[in-house]
């Protein structure tokens, strides 16, 4: 299917009646883009359609051809003056000149990034104009997933086990599905969570934790939505009888929570054996994922931090078997998995996961249009909410407490810090009058903040200017009627006077006043037409 | 028993590619990090390569960098080493090694021979 | 040249005691598990100490030490079929790589 389009002039929204009288004065040019986005995947190119009929006789030096993003105007790509004026998009973007001729006005663009995808406008000028928009949905399929297990030795029956499903660079945010050996979907006790990286694409690291069987076989199943694409990956893990002789070192089964800009204890212990000294440890932090190290304690001494130094051991407690590690001002940017490395004569190690949360902002409600509101009228209410992490829940409701779900579009940018500033808009036809609720939840730290708006749309009365129009209107009829009220009290005393000079004179005056009256009475009736127009 | 088993290594041209792989049995492969050492002949051991147990992350010596990939394949138990633009000095016998959480390269493949000649 | 620094040979006769240094940084050996290997004439490398754990199967003739930034490893009662190379290895913390010395060639006189 072909969207067609034609526009009168670029971006200008010109009144329902001008722009259609504008129209059939010149005629539009028929623009045509594909209806459905155009899917692209990252690195490759794609050709974003355009065309145009050009009429007989065209000749491309009449031909002003522009390229140009839809929400921001800015420039991707022209053709003016019968040349092909170049790519303003990061070099990356070409016409096909020798179709230019035939109508054919569509753009390639190569090596597609994340950062490409959204609208495209094709504004095509010869005499008419025309332009229409073509959206590009960029994807990247996901990784076959990899799994890992923590603990992944000396397992026994009724252990907790944390699997870890990953699959990397993809793009949209995948969908992520676990089931055991027999097919049956497992939805407890999964946390899934997708970060992008420079580039926009994302890994995906969906946890599931399960108690251990005699074994147990566990699938993942990472689907991309755009390119309905599944990637699977599954473990099996039998338990065993542990071996004997290692260093049993313990930490938390669940993630550590740690709020931004605060500190953080990452637990970690040992069991030292009788006669141990500190001269005997070797401790190591590191980054779990990378094998960066954090904070090490070697030779009887803290060896201090090597992770901007923001790490601490607690050194009294070392000989009593604490190594856990303290991690001031945290950030963002920490959270992840650390593992405590303890070696004494044996070894052992474990790893513990901080999860950073930051509580959001008590949002902020706005209205657009925030005036003049009837019932029936559309009105768009954003709720704003700042700097939380992770990524918020927001819900809708209304005075009665019913969840609103259509018409809700939440978006969600972390900044520097990797903070989210959440905003949702709602957009609802407005009754005699209403509450509108939001709630945005933090899901790590179940904080709910909540914003609310009540809106009482006013009767179907005049507008203002119509009020003023009314109130000028009423006050020069009172001066009139109070003009003709003096005039008319004039007369009859002038006509009272002159009674007795005689009947001649009497009939005179009735004539006077006949005249003086009649522009009144034509004023008075201007007063009623003005009335009707108001 | 736990056996690494590296494959495809050959004789092959400057400036021209391999693939050499490495099959785990015996033991959970995806819970591993996994590396890659070589031998030249008559020299000593040389660490050409690492990957973390999920493949997201991955170290190279700096005389391989830019010219050898390593990668793995945790549902078919497989760890990879993709060399390009090989040079003679990169004639040696490659092992694979498993790496494990205490930072003990302690099980090893009996290697696989890359010759590089013209 | 290596990282890590080994003697290039060391010898002695049967029943002997053989030590053999391995000296590295505070970035290696200083901090990190340090890893002893036996290299037998045509074979793989086999792990024989780390730190001072000895893998099942390894002779209790085979000991490690660590002292800040170097290890040494001793072996007691000398057999000809020590007759190898020996090589320690650490994880490097600065150079994100496994750090090797550079070889030692015991001779079993």
């Known amino acids: 299917m072909l969207r067609r389009r034609g526009s009168p002039g670029m971006g200008v929204h010109v009144g329902a009646a001008l722009g259609a009288l504008w129209f059939c004065l010149t005629g539009a040019l028929e623009v045509q883009v594909p209806e459905d986005p155009v899917v692209a995947l990252v690195g490759t190119d794609a050709t974003l359609c355009c065309s145009f009929s050009p009429e007989p006789g065209f000749s491309l030096a009449q031909l002003n051809l522009i390229w140009q993003l839809t929400d921001t105007k800015q420039l991707v790509h022209s053709f003016a003056e019968g040349q092909d004026q170049g790519s303003a998009y990061a070099n990356r973007t070409a016409l096909f000149p020798d179709l230019l001729a035939q109508g054919n006005a569509s753009l390639r663009l190569q090596r597609v990034r994340v950062a490409d995808e959204g609208s495209f406008t094709c504004f095509v000028s010869i005499r008419d104009f025309g332009s229409a928009a073509v959206s590009l949905q960029v994807a990247a399929p996901y990784s076959k997933p990899s799994m890992t297990l923590e603990p992944n030795k000396d397992l026994r029956p009724g252990d907790t086990v944390t699997i870890t499903c990953s699959s990397y660079q993809g793009y949209p945010e995948a969908e992520v599905f676990w089931q055991d050996g027999q097919g049956v979907p497992l939805t407890g006790n999964v946390t899934t969570s997708q970060m992008a990286n420079e580039q926009g694409l994302f890994d995906v690291h969906s946890i599931l934790r399960v108690v251990l069987g005699a074994n147990g076989t566990y699938s993942c199943l990472v689907r991309n939505p755009v390119l309905q694409q599944d990637a699977h990956s599954s473990v099996t893990i039998t338990p065993q009888r542990s071996p004997t002789g290692a260093v049993e070192v313990q930490v938390p089964e669940d993630p550590v929570v740690a709020l931004v800009g605060t500190d953080a204890t990452l637990r970690c212990s040992f069991s030292p054996e009788p006669g141990f000294s500190l001269a005997q440890l070797n401790l190591i932090w590191q980054l779990t994922d990378t094998k960066q190290l954090v904070h090490s304690f070697t030779e009887g001494r803290d060896q201090g931090s090597a992770y901007a130094n923001r790490t601490a051991l607690f050194p009294d407690l070392l000989a009593q078997g604490n190594a856990s590690l303290r991690l001031q001002r945290v950030r963002v940017a920490d959270e992840g998995s650390f593992t405590c490395f303890v070696s004494i004569r044996d070894f052992g190690s474990a790893a513990v996961s901080l999860q950073v949360a930051a509580p959001y902002s008590k949002p902020s409600m706005t209205l657009e249009p925030n005036k003049d509101l009837r019932p029936g009228d559309t009105v768009t209410i954003t709720c704003s909410s700042y700097r939380g992490y992770p990524e918020a829940e927001v819900f809708w409701q209304d005075g009665q407490g019913v969840p609103l779900t259509g018409n809700v579009t939440t978006s969600q940018m972390a900044n520097e810090q990797g903070l989210f500033d959440v905003h949702s808009v709602l957009r609802v036809v407005l009754g005699a009058n209403g509450t509108y609720s939001c709630l945005v939840r933090n899901p790590v730290l179940q904080q709910d903040a909540h914003g609310s708006v009540t809106i009482t749309g006013q009767p179907m009365t005049f507008p203002p200017e119509a009020l003023w129009v009314t109130v000028g209107l009423s006050v020069c009829l009172i001066a009139l009627l109070v003009a003709l009220a003096f005039v008319c009290w004039r007369k009859i005393k002038q006509s009272c006077e002159e009674e007795n000079a005689g009947a001649e004179d009497q009939d005179g005056e009735g004539e006077g006043s006949k005249t003086a009256l009649q522009p009144l009475k034509h004023s008075d009736s201007k007063e009623d037409d003005g009335q009707e127009i108001a | 028993e736990v056996q690494l088993l590296e494959s495809g290594g050959s004789l092959v041209q400057p400036g021209g590619s391999l693939r050499l792989s490495c099959a785990a049995s015996g033991f959970t492969f995806s819970s591993y990090w996994m590396s890659w050492v070589r031998q030249a002949p008559g020299k000593g051991l040389e660490w050409v390569s690492g990957?973390?147990?999920?493949?997201?992350?991955?170290y190279y010596a700096d005389s391989v960098k830019g010219r050898f990939t390593i990668s793995r394949d945790n549902s078919k138990n497989t760890l990879y080493l993709q060399m390009n633009s090989l040079r003679a000095e990169d004639t040696a016998v490659y092992y694979c090694?498993?790496?494990?959480?205490?930072?003990?390269?302690?099980?090893w493949g009996q290697g696989t021979t890359v010759t590089v000649s013209s | 040249q290596s990282v890590l620094t080994q003697p290039p040979s060391a010898s002695g006769t049967p029943g002997q005691r053989v030590t053999i240094s391995c000296s590295g940084s505070s970035s290696n050996i200083g901090r990190r598990t340090v890893n002893w290997y036996q290299q037998l004439p045509g074979t793989a490398p086999k792990l024989l100490i780390s730190n001072s754990q000895r893998p099942s199967g390894v002779p209790d003739r085979f000991s490690g030490s660590k002292s800040g930034t170097s290890a040494s490893l001793a072996i007691t009662g000398l057999q000809s079929e020590d007759e190898a190379d020996y090589y320690c290895?650490?994880?490097?913390?600065?150079?994100?790589?496994?750090?090797f010395g550079g070889g030692t060639k015991l001779t079993v006189l």
């Open positions: 290895a650490s994880w490097d913390d600065s150079l994100n790589a496994w750090v």
């Open positions: 090694a498993r790496w494990n959480d205490y930072d003990i390269m302690d099980v």
């Open positions: 990957i973390s147990s999920s493949g997201s992350a991955t």
